[in-house]
Amino acid sequence: HAPEDPSDLLQHVKFQSSNFENILTWDSGPEGTPDTVYSIEYKTYGERDWVAKKGCQRITRKSCNLTVETGNLTELYYARVTAVSAGGRSATKMTDRFSSLQHTTLKPPDVTCISKVRSIQMIVHPTPTPIRAGDGHRLTLEDIFHDLFYHLELQVNRTYQMHLGGKQREYEFFGLTPDTEFLGTIMICVPTWAKESAPYMCRVKTLPDRTWT
């Protein structure tokens, strides 16, 4: 039977999405116990029927990976969790409408920072996602967001930073002092979706200038 308040058993049902990996998470309520079991369903906007997620029925953990089930970038999804306590009490709660394009956050890019004598090179590696194209290959963030660009910053000292940016994958900061440490930060930006990744940071030291020895 339904509890007096569904929040007694179940709270904070939501999608947590990063780089299009879409995980449903929730918390137990104050009357939830370790033997409370959870069953997950999902559906798309405007559809009547909820689909039970295989592998997430009568589970005790508080998360369920719905990446595959929510992989259409243009679709709106919902998920809902039904909690059943050992005593037979139940509660159901659903997420807000979920759009992976809108709601996914961006992880820091994967970057290789290469030290040279008077420059530092930064090579950004394409970020794979779980999203698959029609032919089955995995799309990168660049494939999905056509206006994606990279913002790079090199902290030279407390008051001076150098900036580079663009869509290309290779960058180089020139005119640096040899044998000096610099802090580089690289972010992914997607203006149309107002997205900005957390920064990748690399602390690198230019090589010593051996030409004078």
């Epitope: 339904a2 569904p6 049902v13 939501k14 798309t44 906007y45 405007g46 009547r48 259409n72 243009t74 679709e75 709106l76 919902y78 809902r80 509660a91 159901t92 709660k93 659903m94 997420t95 807000d96 409408r97």
Partner: antibody, heavy 116, light 113 residues
Framework: EVQLVESGGGLVQPGGSLRLSCAAS????????MNWVRQAPGKGLEWIGE????????TYNQKFKGRATLSVDQSKNTAYLQMNSLRAEDTAVYYC?????????WGQGTLVTVSS | DIVMTQSPDSLAVSLGERATINCKSS????????????LAWYQQKPGQPPKLLIY???SRESGVPDRFSGSGSGTDFTLTISSLQAEDVAVYYC?????????FGQGTKVEIK
């Protein structure tokens, strides 16, 4: 069987407020979205807004934003519509209706008359 | 806001004859994710709330007689009652759920001739 029952309608003075209730039975309110729609006498249907009872997230028709507030009491399985600064043209039957896109279950409606 | 315009405002049809109601939207209601149209039809009888008849432009709600059918795509939609019955006398509304705010047509009153 799913049932929605509105209450709280009646005569209200211009400038006054009202709080309408929509008691859901036959299902858990938190298992679907709830909408409010109104219909002035002899007129068409007008969507006021929706609420996700699980999260409290609301979306309003801009026409009513600032005057309408949707809320729920999960423990009572009941949704609410609060309307402020009422005027004569707010006289209507107010319905709650379930679902997230189109509306599969409707209450019988409650009549609100705004008049001095 | 998407404007929904129904025609005619009212029509009188003989029992057993076909009734056709049109609904036009001010922008396309085609939902790219599933290539369906975000349009619903309702029937409202005096003193009652609306009753869902059709959703996704052509899917009939459970329990609705098969004389009711919906068709159309993009911006032009039709509700057809293939053989009008006395109990079909009502006002019919279309509704779009493509974008907020959800909007309804002004209604079409169907009467017996």
């Amino acid at each position: 069987e799913v049932q929605l029952v509105e209450s709280g309608g009646g005569l209200v003075q211009p400038g006054g407020s009202l709080r309408l209730s929509c008691a859901a039975s036959g299902y858990s309110l938190t298992a679907d979205y709830m909408n409010w729609v109104r219909q002035a006498p002899g007129k068409g249907l007008e969507w006021i807004g929706e609420i996700n009872p699980s999260t409290g997230t609301t979306t309003y028709n801009q026409k009513f934003k600032g005057r309408a507030t949707l809320s729920v009491d999960q423990s009572k399985n009941t949704a609410y519509l609060q309307m402020n600064s009422l005027r004569a043209e707010d006289t209507a039957v107010y319905y709650c209706a379930r679902f997230d896109a189109y509306f599969d279950y409707w209450g019988q409606g409650t009549l609100v008359t705004v008049s001095s | 806001d998407i404007v929904m315009t129904q025609s005619p405002d009212s029509l009188a049809v003989s029992l057993g004859e076909r009734a056709t109601i049109n609904c036009k939207s001010s922008q396309s209601l085609l939902y790219s994710s599933n290539q369906k149209n975000t349009l619903a039809w309702y029937q409202q009888k005096p003193g009652q709330p609306p009753k869902l008849l059709i959703y996704w432009a052509s899917s009939r709600e459970s329990g609705v007689p098969d004389r009711f059918s919906g068709s159309g795509s993009g911006t032009d939609f039709t509700l057809t009652i293939s053989s009008l019955q006395a109990e079909d006398v009502a006002v019919y509304y279309c509704q779009q759920y493509f974008s907020y705010p959800f909007t309804f047509g002004q209604g079409t009153k169907v009467e017996i001739k």
